[in-house]
């Protein structure tokens, strides 16, 4: 008999036939049978995990922790289900490995081809860093702005906690080393993260005391939006900051995006214990 669902993989799902479920309850459709939101179907003596997601055509690209780009978060979850492996959203937008779009006859500097610079000291700049060739020494500049990124704490491969995937990308760029998302939520043993100060240097911020204090202090600087901004935030509260031209949205739980218009599936990526969540 098969010993795990991975032994039963088929192109459309996982199919386990030819066993007696009274002798082996491993393949019963329970809350733990299908990981990564596969739908468990039991027909006769066959158990199949089906990954038939109803993904839409919205173009809101995301970059997965496996280095692949997806049209939107639903396609990423679909792939995670199909592969039965965890794929996290590392950043919004396509992964940085793509060159210019198109076929080579437009304005694109990339023109659909990977434009290879002549070998220079700039070749050492990696992980999203841009090179300042005018500097006397080799300077790798990280022009990554995480100020507009939603709060979604993550534990990274360097053992540190970060407020969101953008900050991990920023730290990876700043340190010029590979730092990846390991899991959702803060790291259990280490509660520090790196944040950039106004002068562009990095400082360690300790979150061990109370993460809510940060949110509370930030909220003090916000005022409710003027009436003509009614409907600006679909699932959240509209807030106006004195030092910001445009208002921002504080999203309700389960929503994300500039206007809280997108369902935030990422909050369900890592499931504690044997409980299986169903996406709605």
């Amino acid at each position: 008999f098969p010993t795990s669902l991975s032994d039963c993989q088929t192109p459309t799902g996982w199919n386990c036939s030819g066993y007696d479920d009274r002798e082996n309850d491993l393949f019963l459709c329970d809350t733990n049978t299908c990981k990564f939101d596969g739908e468990c179907l039991r027909i006769g003596d066959t158990v199949t995990c089906v990954c038939q997601f109803k993904c839409n055509n919205d173009y809101v690209p995301v970059c997965g922790s496996n280095g692949e780009s997806y049209q939107n978060e639903c396609y990423l979850r679909q792939a995670a289900c199909k592969q039965q492996s965890e794929i996290l959203v590392v950043s919004e937008g396509s992964c940085a490995t793509d060159a210019g779009s198109g076929s080579g006859d437009g304005v694109h500097e990339g023109s659909g081809e990977t434009s290879q610079k002549e070998t220079s000291t700039c070749d050492i700049c990696q992980f999203g860093a841009e090179c300042d060739e005018d500097a006397e020494d080799v300077w790798c500049v990280c022009n990554i702005d995480c100020s507009q990124t939603n709060f979604n704490p993550l534990c990274a491969s360097d053992g540190k906690s970060y407020d969101n995937a953008c900050q991990i990308k920023e730290a990876s760029c700043q340190k010029q080393e590979k730092i990846e998302v390991m899991s959702l939520g803060r790291c259990q043993d280490n509660t520090t993260t790196t944040t950039k100060s106004e002068d562009g240097h990095y400082a360690r911020t300790d979150y061990a005391e109370n993460a809510n204090k940060l949110e509370e202090s930030a909220r003090e600087h916000h005022i409710p939006c003027p009436e003509h901004y009614n409907g600006f935030c679909m699932h959240g509260k509209c807030e106006h900051s004195i030092n910001m031209q445009e208002p921002s949205c504080r999203c309700d739980a389960g929503y994300t995006g500039q206007h809280c218009e997108k369902k935030d599936y990422s909050v369900l990526y890592v499931v504690p214990g044997p409980v299986r969540f169903q996406y709605v």
Epitope: C55, D58, Y59, V60, S69, A79, S101, G112, Q258, E261
Partner: antibody, heavy 112, light 108 residues
Framework: QIHLVQSGPELKKPGETVKISCKAS????????MNWVKQAPGKGFKWMGW????????TYADDFKGRFAFSLETSVSIAYLQINSLKNEDTATYFC?????WGQGTTLTVSS | DIQMTQSPASLYASVGETVTITCRAS??????LAWFQQKQGKSPHLLVY???TLAAGVPSRFSGSGSGTQFSLKITSLQPEDFGSYYC??????????FGGGTKLEIK
């Protein structure tokens, strides 16, 4: 390197059927939907619909329901557009698109 | 269905100039608007999506702005390769893509 390469120009008579192919490369085919767009001579773009490359489920715009069919050959990363019972007004260039990348277009001429 | 209205329909400019093309949506589409360039007989090229995010490889002389119903594409210091047709496109929230009527940018 991402490319969408479409089949060559077609000259058809009214009432015939045409099948246009779009071969994708340089990315994981099932990670992005495939859209089809029509551009009549000297005109703008008209979205025809899209196909979920993972499930194979097509969605058609109202003006393209009936004679038009999207299909896939996922194993070789190819999307197809088939137009049945061709009419003169089907004369146009048809593009496949994953939004950020477009095919080079297939020109279809329908004439008796 | 959402309607996208682009203006002007045609525009004449010289190399080095700055031009702005606008696009109006019939209802709030937040920031989900893209801009494409198309040259005669060629396929479209994505320039901007999410109203202001530059696509990979697009020169910084292109910039997008706006949200809600009003959007614009600005091209500074026009280059010879910038002449062609430009289209705006709504890309989120409904199953359809909706395109503007296009703006033809020609050399003065």
């Amino acid at each position: 390197q991402i490319h969408l390469v479409q089949s060559g120009p077609e000259l058809k008579k009214p009432g015939e059927t045409v099948k246009i192919s779009c071969k994708a490369s340089g990315y994981t085919f099932t990670n992005f939907a495939m859209n089809w767009v029509k551009q009549a001579p000297g005109k703008g773009f008209k979205w025809m619909g899209w196909i979920n490359t993972y499930t194979g489920e097509p969605t058609y715009a109202d003006d393209f329901k009936g004679r038009f069919a999207f299909s896939l050959e996922t194993s070789v990363s190819i999307a197809y557009l088939q137009i049945n019972s061709l009419k003169n007004e089907d004369t146009a260039t048809y593009f496949c698109s994953k939004f950020d990348y477009w095919g080079q277009g297939t020109t279809l001429t329908v004439s008796s | 269905d959402i309607q996208m209205t682009q203006s002007p329909a045609s525009l004449y400019a010289s190399v080095g100039e700055t031009v702005t093309i606008t696009c109006r949506a019939s209802e709030n589409i937040y920031s989900y608007l893209a801009w494409f360039q198309q040259k005669q007989g060629k396929s479209p090229h994505l320039l901007v999506y999410n109203a202001k995010t530059l696509a990979a490889g697009v020169p910084s002389r292109f910039s997008g702005s706006g949200s809600g119903t009003q959007f614009s594409l600005k091209i500074t210091s026009l280059q010879p390769e910038d002449f062609g047709s430009y289209y705006c496109q709504h890309h989120y929230g409904t199953p359809t893509w909706t395109f503007g009527g296009g703006t033809k940018l020609e050399i003065k």
